[in-house]
Amino acid sequence: EEELQVIQPDKSISVAAGESATLHCTVTSLIPVGPIQWFRGAGPGRELIYNQKEGHFPRVTTVSDLTKRNNMDFSIRISNITPADAGTYYCVKFRKGSPDHVEFKSGAGTELSVRAKPSAPVVSGPAARATPQHTVSFTCESHGFSPRDITLKWFKNGNELSDFQTNVDPAGDSVSYSIHSTAKVVLTREDVHSQVICEVAHVTLQGDPLRGTANLSETIRVPPTLEVTQQPVRAENQVNVTCQVRKFYPQRLQLTWLENGNVSRTETASTLTENKDGTYNWMSWLLVNVSAHRDDVKLTCQVEHDGQPAVSKSHDLKVSAHPKEQGSNTAPGPALASAAPLGGSG
């Protein structure tokens, strides 16, 4: 009679984490008498997965009824597969012996690989804001995937980026892997509404990649441009001076008016105008009582934006160009009178 063969038809199988794996095994003969055992690995360190005769294997069920006298199918199903279950599984026939069964024949083995989805990519930007023309780094991380092969791409507003470096860890074997990528992005003044996207593609995602995003509004600082202008005379002794603060981001801004270098008023930007590109404009104005000045006045609009060093713009107000009030005995009012509401807004 032909000697018993142990047939494992599948050289390899791939199963998604959480699913069940079916490991097929048939024998070609009922002789010799003895049990079948399933092992992961080979040699003295192999791990017993299922023993037909004894033991408790809660995740393992047999595909066919092993109690039937003529059964030759010893396939098993392992439930709730995790990446830690990866390995080579062997179906081994033992021959009845005393006191122990003797290993008789082994199948060729079935390699089980486990597919695990990557976690949603998390994109993080620099800790501090940066200004246009500067290069900033963004990182993208995703974890827990298997197998190791994975593709990561970076985009800015739909345009693919090329300046990035990606590592998949660990370099050696692991039940699951992580990816870490750093991309360099050059900021422009128009980037307040821009997004940086990290896209991860993996065999487990069936062509539907995962994306992580970061808004450049959290990274960029667009410094304001200042313009101080003198408006036409409102009343005979009053001049309206405005400070236009344009194209800044974020909103946090404090403005100080100085008269010949002396602080006269400080105000915080409140009602702002938003531009199409996401930046803001703001305007503050002053009514200057010219009659209170004997000499020309240097007015300075000083702006502190988002905690950065102040920038300023000055305007020289020519007093001589305006007639002085004659014969007034009343003490002059304050040199600077602001319009109501205080500071105004535009």
């Epitope: 690995g41 040699g43 360190g45 192999r46 390995g87 080579t88 081994v92 024949k105």
Partner: antibody, heavy 122, light 112 residues
Framework: QVQLQESGPGLVRPSETLSLTCTVS????????WSWIRQPPGKGLEWMGF???????FYNPSLKSRVTISLDMSMNQFSLKMTSVTAADTAVYYC????????????????WGQGTTVTVSS | DIVMTQSPLSLPVTPGEPASISCKSS???????????LDWYLQRPGQSPQLLIY???NRASGVPDRFSGSGSGTDFTLKISRVEAEDVGVYYC?????????FGGGTKVEIK
């Protein structure tokens, strides 16, 4: 092709612990046993122990109380620690790969590192 | 532990001539699956050992066919059909039936 590289200090003081690492490159740790074998100067080979890909260890009883072999699959490395060393532990230490097949068992130590000399001296 | 005994201790050889090394084990290395758990290794001067023969008679990859292994149970032989200069070194047998794996004391092959 698979290569093994031992690393660790060349000199260890008596009564201290010897620590060696073997880095596996060009192949996987899975499905193999990973051995440490030593050779005292001018003498023969002594098997110290091995570890399987699942972390199961087997040691030479003559050294068992002093030897620990561990595996870091993520780094493709395995390590040897031997405590309370004496001058008798001076040797060339080799790391090696042992093949294994179901139905056969151990099937030859087919890849060896180049060996690292460890001297135990004060 | 299984004790492995090699002979001779030293073997002077002439290039082109055959050579033979004996290895005996203190217990049978023949398992019920019909395999003999005996390997042969060559350690060339200043080098690491290399696998020549595994499971008693199987030549390892890249090993010249002038090397052959034979024997069963407790008595094993490594034969070199025609010795070449590169064959000098120490030859070791090793049993892989059970742990601890044990080596023979070695046979030093040198050119006459």
């Amino acid at each position: 092709q698979v290569q093994l590289q031992e690393s660790g200090p060349g000199l260890v003081r008596p009564s201290e612990t010897l620590s060696l690492t073997c880095t596996v490159s060009g192949g996987s740790i899975r499905n193999y046993y990973w051995s440490w074998i030593r050779q005292p100067p001018g003498k023969g080979l002594e098997w110290m122990g091995f570890i399987y890909d699942n972390g199961r260890t087997f040691y030479n009883p003559s050294l068992k109380s002093r030897v620990t072999i561990s595996l870091d699959m993520s780094m493709n490395q395995f390590s040897l620690k031997m405590t309370s060393v004496t001058a008798a532990d001076t040797a060339v230490y080799y790391c090696a790969r042992v093949r294994a097949y179901s139905g056969i068992g151990l099937d030859g130590t087919d890849v060896w590192g180049q060996g690292t000399t460890v001297t135990v001296s004060s | 532990d299984i004790v492995m005994t090699q002979s001779p201790l030293s073997l002077p050889v002439t290039p082109g001539e055959p050579a033979s090394i004996s290895c005996k084990s203190s217990q049978s290395l023949l398992y019920s699956n019909a395999y003999n758990y005996l390997d042969w290794y060559l350690q060339r001067p200043g080098q690491s050992p290399q696998l020549l023969i595994y499971l008693g008679s199987n030549r390892a990859s890249g090993v010249p066919d002038r090397f052959s292994g034979s024997g069963s149970g407790t008595d094993f032989t490594l034969k070199i059909s025609r010795v070449e200069a590169e064959d000098v070194g120490v030859y070791y047998c090793m049993q892989a039936l059970q742990t601890p794996l044990t080596f023979g004391g070695g046979t030093k092959v040198e050119i006459k």
